[in-house]
């Protein structure tokens, strides 16, 4: 769709005569008829296939034509067309004399024609005017013309309809060729797709308007490139959504079970050495002078029984002092003035002379110790019980009384809640920090898989020959009730028909 525009500029008819040579009376009151048609090698009369237009009287004899309106007409003259511009045309411009006010063709005598020009040629769509001048023996016409596209039509032949748009069916303006030019922030064939925030993850992010980055379920972050871990994940991360991959030192479904209590909580006091001994359990090895589960208690220096050979220990502000029994001397009463002749070994210990009789050593029987076998062995002095277990002497042996949740000879083992097999019917037990969880096999449910869920054993239609199937809820098996003439666990065998008798 477009418009052929014709701008009449000047008409010269100095003698004021008609085409016949006869003069106009009193002068030639001139108007124009224009015929636009398809290209003809020789322009001939016939239908004006591209359109016609007439002007009012524009002047007398010779005159210049003003732009825009003139006596109600328009200049340039408009010849609209609703088809693809072919690029070629024929144009006929006739100048007529109007004796009266009626300008209709049938109201004019045929000899009222002043002049007629016909041109044809190629004409491309464009904004530039083509200037032309046609001269006959008596007249001269100067004019210009061009073809432009109608509003919203584009391209070399005005065939491309394009209307600028800025709504959810497109965000664009139109290029001279009719192609769309997307507004900033939009893309796609019809410029209806927003361009998301730069870097927004292609799969995990999207947007409904430009420079936005909305995350799909399971993703987060400004660019939707961070996965969201499992809800409740405490000390873990993810590489895909809803995962919970535990950080070092943590375990369990939600990474909330502490496998490195020592590092995370530093429970051991007074420079003690901490050792992890299981989930949320640990053992503190105390430095000399300290005791307690967490080595939080300071020992009296005499508590370590530093005085030997029956010496008695006295605490002092700057340490301790040993009061030695007769026959002994030294800081810890470690030196003896006795010999084997003095029978220094108690509790059946045997005496062995050393240094040519200047000294001796006692070899103690089991359960006794000390330089003179004077001490009953206390097997608990080395704090052998882990995790706060209490050490008890039992004659020649010792035992550990463990705190709840721990077991083993030295209370070194964490008691698993699953150890007592609490899950019924073959359920799988999972230790959690605050209890346990059972994963039940098909057909069972409940916290301990104790509830039997009915399995429809008949769902697979196991019975043949139109037998009726019943589910035995106690065993989750099926029973087939056979119709007459069939037997078998699935009613699969026909019963032999009774023989026919001849009588």
């Amino acid at each position: 769709s477009g418009v052929f525009q014709l701008q009449l500029q000047e008409f010269i008819n100095e003698r004021g005569v008609l085409a016949s040579g006869r003069p106009c009376e009193p002068g030639c009151r001139t108007f124009f008829r224009v015929c636009l048609k398809h290209f003809q090698a020789v322009v001939s009369p016939g239908p004006c296939t591209f359109g016609t237009v007439s002007t009012p009287v524009l002047g007398t004899n010779s005159f210049a034509v003003r732009d825009d309106s003139s006596g109600g007409g328009r200049n340039p003259l408009q010849l609209p067309f609703n088809f693809t511009w072919p690029g070629t045309f024929s144009l006929i411009i006739e100048a007529w004399h109007a004796p009266g006010d009626d300008l209709r063709p049938e109201a004019l005598p045929p000899d009222a024609l002043i002049s007629k020009i016909a041109i044809q040629g190629s004409l491309a769509v464009g904004q530039n005017w083509l200037l032309d001048e046609q001269t006959s023996t008596l007249t001269r016409l100067r004019y210009s013309y061009r073809v432009i596209c109608s509003d919203n039509y584009y391209g070399d032949n005005c065939s491309r309809l394009c209307k600028k748009r800025n709504d959810h069916f497109g965000h664009y303006v139109c290029q001279p060729d009719g192609n769309l030019s997307c507004l900033p922030g939009w893309t796609g064939e019809y410029c209806q797709q927003p361009i998301c925030l730069s870097g927004c993850h292609e799969q995990n992010g999207y947007c409904s308007k430009p420079a936005e980055c909305l995350c799909r379920p399971g993703w987060q972050g400004r660019l939707c490139n961070e996965c969201i871990p499992h809800n409740g994940c405490r000390h873990g991360t993810c590489s895909t959504p809803w995962q919970c991959t535990c950080d070092e030192g943590w375990g369990g479904l939600f990474c909330d079970q502490d496998l490195n209590y020592c590092t995370h909580h530093s429970p051991c006091k007074n420079g003690a050495t901490c050792s992890n001994s299981g989930q949320r359990s640990y053992t503190c090895t105390c430095r000399p002078g300290y005791t307690g589960v967490d080595c939080e208690l300071e020992l009296s220096e005499c508590d370590s029984n530093p005085c030997r050979n029956g010496g008695s220990c006295k605490d002092q502000e700057d340490g301790y002092h040993c009061l030695c029994p007769p026959g002994y001397y030294g800081l810890h009463c470690e030196h003896s003035t006795l010999s084997c002749a003095d029978s220094p070994c108690f509790n059946g210990g045997s005496c062995r002379e050393r240094n040519q009789g200047a000294n001796y050593a006692c070899e103690c029987p089991p359960n006794f110790t000390g330089s003179n076998c004077e001490k009953k062995v206390d097997r608990c002095t080395s704090n052998p019980c882990a995790n706060g277990g209490q050490c008890l002497n039992r004659g020649p042996s010792r035992m550990c009384r463990c705190r709840p949740g721990f077991t083993g000879t030295y209370c070194e083992l964490h008691v698993s809640d699953c150890a007592r097999n609490p899950c019924a019917h073959g359920g799988t037990c999972h230790d959690l920090e605050n209890g346990l969880m059972c994963t039940c096999p098909a057909g069972f449910s409940g916290r301990r898989c104790e509830v039997r869920t009915s399995i429809d054993a008949c769902a697979s239609s196991p019975c043949f020959n139109r037998a009726t199937c019943y589910t035995d809820l106690s065993t989750d098996t099926f029973v087939c009730n056979c119709p007459y003439g069939f037997v078998g666990s699935r009613c699969e065998f026909p019963v032999g028909l009774p023989p026919s008798f001849p009588w």
Epitope: N152, L161, K163, G170, Y190, S208
Partner: antibody
Framework: EVQLQESGPGLVKPSETLSLTCTVS??????????WGWIRQPPGKGLEWIGD???????YYNPSLKSRVTISVDTSKNQFSLKLSSVTAADTAVYYC??????FGGGADSWGQGTLVTVSS | SYELTQPPSVSVSPGQTASITCSGD??????VSWYQQKPGQSPVLVIY???QRPSGIPERFSGSNSGDTATLTISGTQAMDEADYYC?????????FGSGTKVTVL
């Protein structure tokens, strides 16, 4: 060929919420080439556009109904839905769901058969 | 709000041309769609983007749009063309329908 089917109650009480669902078959709702719209037609009257939505949930509503309308999409079920709150007798109409094609300049090239919703106590 | 105005009715003899107009402010700058609706049926798109026909729509349906007026033309009208016709355009992200024109084939 894509087909649309409206479903929902045919009778709603005044002041309650009208809820309809449109199920799309023969094509995916998750296409950037279409919007999915609701249009209604009161008995003996003309068509009125209610609103539309695309697969990522961008919605556009008729300004005169905007305060009462919610349109949502469920791509997993290939469905989109209409909720119209605080209904009155004036909301009695045949409600159509339709597919609006971006390549048709927004023209609705496929329609459901429509469902009559009557607002009455 | 934007309004589209259509004549309530148009009558045409079989084989003749029916023209239905749709008027709105600067409508020529918007794309117009036309829908045909027969009694008891859903609307059918017959013209989109002013003058384009969807597949399956007969060539006798044509459209134009300029200035403030869009026109749907049915040339060689048939009895089966008797229906209500609605124009539709988009304004400020909202769909707008015309009031509808009843075409009667005499």
């Amino acid at each position: 060929e894509v087909q649309l089917q409206e479903s929902g109650p045919g009778l709603v009480k005044p002041s309650e919420t009208l809820s309809l669902t449109c199920t799309v078959s023969g094509g995916s709702i998750s296409s950037g080439s279409y919007y999915w719209g609701w249009i209604r037609q009161p008995p003996g009257k003309g068509l009125e556009w209610i609103g539309d939505i695309n697969y990522i949930g961008s919605t556009y509503y008729n300004p005169s109904l905007k305060s009462r309308v919610t349109i949502s999409v469920d791509t997993s079920k290939n469905q989109f839905s209409l909720k119209l709150s605080s209904v009155t007798a004036a909301d009695t109409a045949v409600y159509y769901c339709a597919r609006e094609a971006v390549s048709f300049g927004g023209g609705a090239d496929s329609w459901g058969q429509g469902t009559l919703v009557t607002v009455s106590s | 709000s934007y309004e589209l105005t259509q004549p309530p009715s148009v009558s045409v003899s079989p084989g003749q041309t029916a023209s239905i107009t749709c008027s709105g402010d600067r409508l020529g700058d918007k794309y117009v769609s036309w829908y045909q609706q027969k009694p008891g049926q859903s609307p059918v798109l017959v013209i989109y983007e002013d003058s384009q026909r969807p597949s399956g729509i007969p060539e006798r349906f044509s459209g134009s749009n300029s200035g403030d007026t869009a026109t749907l033309t049915i040339s060689g009208t048939q009895a089966m063309d008797e229906a209500d016709y609605y124009c539709q355009a988009w304004d400020m992200e909202a769909g707008v329908f015309g009031s509808g024109t009843k075409v009667t084939v005499l």
